[in-house]
């Protein structure tokens, strides 16, 4: 339905608050550099002109496509080449080659400070001071540093910071209240950042039909009970609103989010019978609630999928009418069978299915080379299933942050050209599996902890892409989205790499170690046995942990002492000797 | 949306020969193998012929082998069945179908009398 003015027409589905929320993440996204009231003053200036339109559709420039509008307004900053360097280039662009330009620039690694965060008393004197500001603030800072953190859930995440303010700012004991609501918010934030960034991922690096073969999988699991057309119509539609947002067009991304929401309220009955909380709540939470809702129960006596996709003899028959239709269903027949599966192993299943037809459908006799298909199933179901018990087995006998550093030594010597710092936050990501997924029953472990790595490794490779240092990690992220978390798994140690040179500096500690939080003081040790793995690759296991030891009981000891500082520089310089022995550094 | 058109059939004396054609469209011809089968009057449906999709491998039912010839040119996206030596019991509505799938078009009748 074409509108004579689009800015007007989002505006007015939007509301003047939303509208406004989703053009500063918008810009926060584009332009991760730039001061808070700069981007305050832009928005401001849109929203005035977007009221203009609103009041008539006829007045100049109204008639403007969003990304015409927003691309000349973000070309108005002053300091664009300054501050971004060749991204000051876009403006030279017609769109929609700016737009393009500028999603280009997105930096997932953005040089930006740690965010602090102050004192409670200090929050809510700012909160109360001035609560719009506030709340705007969070928006941009969250945005600036997820440039593609999904918009309208942004807005949610945004509504809960702002009760969890408006309840505990009154409380008795203010801090006992608000920080670990604003600890759940950010562990979740980045959960949400994370999965968004693989949905965009693979969008943008692996095209449409990537997407919507992983929706059809996922909808198929959550909604058993509906029909093929029906989650057809629902991956069309999810399709659209995650292609908006990871392009940069938020409002209509919001906006198409909305009226997905409401079409699946309004048709629960012929797709779940467990969304009937989610749809009573208002807009954001009911969004969010859907896209977290349990998977409905499967329906009784399906029959067996080997009459249509094996035993029919009109199966390359279908599959010649229309390939993707074909494959579709059967990735949904499957999926809905089978909420104890991971989506990628879904479509490794489909992708091997689909390997197998293009071969025996060109086959003068097709059945007989099909026939035993789901044979080769077997194998591709049973390496995450053993993976998975073997690494809860590890987990559970090591306990959290050991296993993270099992992983960091098996990650960094399988790919040890990649930063220190992204293998310690790739490898603590990935060692999380452990406590997310282990205590989960057999038939929720594979979807819980494959999907999740599959998540931590797109970070991964995004992170690289940025500054590639490594083929192999090139070759596992970009030759198959469904098979990078194998590929990963199949990295055996780089006899190729050169041991990085001994700095004694890289394993000098401070006494400001004892005064850090324990996720901090973790973070510093394993960047530590990081960079011990790139000083001696074939470490063994006991080597690590022996040195890993006495480097416990180092920092234990020295923030005991009276003078940590001659503590930590005597001692120090006896355990670096120590190790260098113990390693034959 | 697929389409498969036979033609070439009629009525023929025993002994006789009869080329039956079958164009395709609406899918990638070249990438699927083919077949022909025919179903007789009263009687059910009856594998005839084979040919894969690069032509290299052809199947013919026993009650037709030495005497039809399948061929294919993927270029044309077309299907041939030559039948040679033709005898009453070969009389049956021919059908041209993907892979050994169940016919989905008109077919064309060939018939076999004196």
């Known amino acids: 339905d074409a509108h004579k003015s689009e800015v007007a027409h989002r505006f007015k589905d939007l509301g003047e608050e939303n509208f406004k929320a989703l053009v500063l993440i918008a810009f926060a996204q584009y332009l991760q550099q730039c001061p808070f009231e700069d981007h305050v003053k832009l928005v401001n200036e849109v929203t005035e002109f977007a009221k203009t339109c609103v009041a008539d559709e006829s007045a100049e420039n109204c008639d403007k496509s969003l990304h015409t509008l927003f691309g000349d307004k973000l070309c108005t900053v002053a300091t664009l080449r300054e501050t971004y360097g060749e991204m000051a280039d876009c403006c030279a662009k017609q769109e929609p080659e700016r737009n393009e330009c500028f999603l280009q620039h997105k930096d997932d690694n953005p040089n930006l400070p740690r965010l602090v965060r102050p004192e409670v008393d200090v929050m809510c004197t700012a909160f109360h001071d001035n609560e719009e500001t506030f709340l705007k603030k969070y928006l941009y800072e969250i945005a600036r540093r997820h440039p593609y953190f999904y918009a309208p859930e942004l807005l949610f995440f945004a509504k809960r910071y702002k009760a969890a303010f408006t309840e505990c700012c009154q409380a008795a004991d203010k801090a006992a209240c608000l920080l670990p609501k604003l600890d759940e918010l950010r562990d979740e934030g980045k959960a949400s950042s994370a999965k968004q960034r693989l949905k965009c991922a693979s969008l943008q690096k692996f095209g449409e039909r990537a997407f919507k073969a992983w929706a059809v999988a996922r909808l198929s699991q959550r909604f058993p009970k509906a029909e093929f057309a029906e989650v057809s119509k629902l991956v069309t539609d999810l399709t659209k609103v995650h292609t908006e947002c990871c392009h940069g067009d938020l409002l209509e991304c919001a906006d198409d989010r909305a009226d997905l929401a409401k079409y699946i309220c309004e048709n629960q009955d012929s797709i779940s019978s467990k969304l009937k909380e989610c749809c009573e709540k208002p807009l954001l939470e009911k969004s969010h609630c859907i896209a977290e809702v349990e998977n409905d129960e499967m329906p009784a006596d399906l029959p067996s999928l080997a009459a249509d996709f094996v035993e029919s003899k009109d199966v390359c028959k279908n599959y010649a009418e229309a390939k993707d239709v074909f494959l579709g269903m059967f990735l949904y027949e499957y999926a809905r069978r089978h909420p104890d599966y991971s989506v990628v192993l879904l479509l490794r299943l489909a992708k091997t299915y689909e390997t197998t037809l293009e071969k025996c459908c060109a086959a003068a006799d097709p059945h007989e080379c099909y026939a035993k298909v789901f044979d080769e199933f077997k194998p591709l179901v049973e390496e995450p299933q053993n993976l998975i018990k073997q690494n809860c087995e590890l987990f559970e006998q090591l306990g959290e942050y050991k296993f993270q550093n099992a992983l960091l030594v098996r990650y960094t010597k399988k790919v040890p050209q990649v930063s220190t710092p992204t293998l310690v936050e790739v490898s603590r990501n990935l060692g999380k599996v452990g406590s997310k997924c282990c205590k989960h029953p057999e038939a929720k472990r594979m979807p819980c902890a494959e999907d999740y790595l599959s998540v931590v490794l797109n970070q991964l490779c995004v992170l690289h892409e940025k500054t590639p240092v490594s083929d192999r990690v090139t070759k596992c992220c970009t030759e198959s989205l469904v098979n990078r978390r194998p590929c990963f798994s199949a990295l055996e140690v780089d006899e190729t790499y050169v041991p990085k040179e001994f700095n004694a500096e890289t394993f000098t500690f401070h006494a400001d170690i004892c005064t850090l939080s324990e996720k901090e003081r973790q973070i510093k040790k394993q960047t530590a046995l990081v960079e011990l793995v790139k000083h001696k690759p074939k470490a063994t296991k006991e080597q690590l942990k022996a040195v890993m030891d006495d480097f416990a009981a180092f920092v234990e000891k020295c923030c005991k002492a009276d003078d940590k500082e001659t503590c930590f520089a005597e001692e120090g310089k006896k355990l670096v000797a120590a190790s260098q022995a113990a390693l034959g550094l | 949306q697929v389409q498969l058109q036979e033609s070439g059939g009629g009525l023929v004396q025993p002994g006789g020969s009869l080329r039956l054609t079958c164009t395709a469209s609406g899918f990638t011809f070249r990438s699927f193998g083919m077949s022909w089968v025919r179903q007789a009057p009263g009687k059910g449906l009856e594998w005839v012929s084979a040919?894969?999709?690069?032509?290299?491998?052809?199947r013919y039912a026993d009650s037709v082998k030495g005497r039809f010839t399948i061929s294919r040119d993927n270029g044309k996206k077309m299907l041939t069945l030559d039948m040679n030596s033709l005898k009453p019991e070969d009389t049956a509505v021919y059908y041209c179908?993907?892979?050994?799938?169940?016919?989905a078009s008109q077919g064309t009748q060939v018939t076999v009398s004196s």
């Open positions: 040919i894969s999709a690069d032509g290299s491998d052809k």
């Open positions: 179908v993907i892979g050994r799938g169940s016919p």
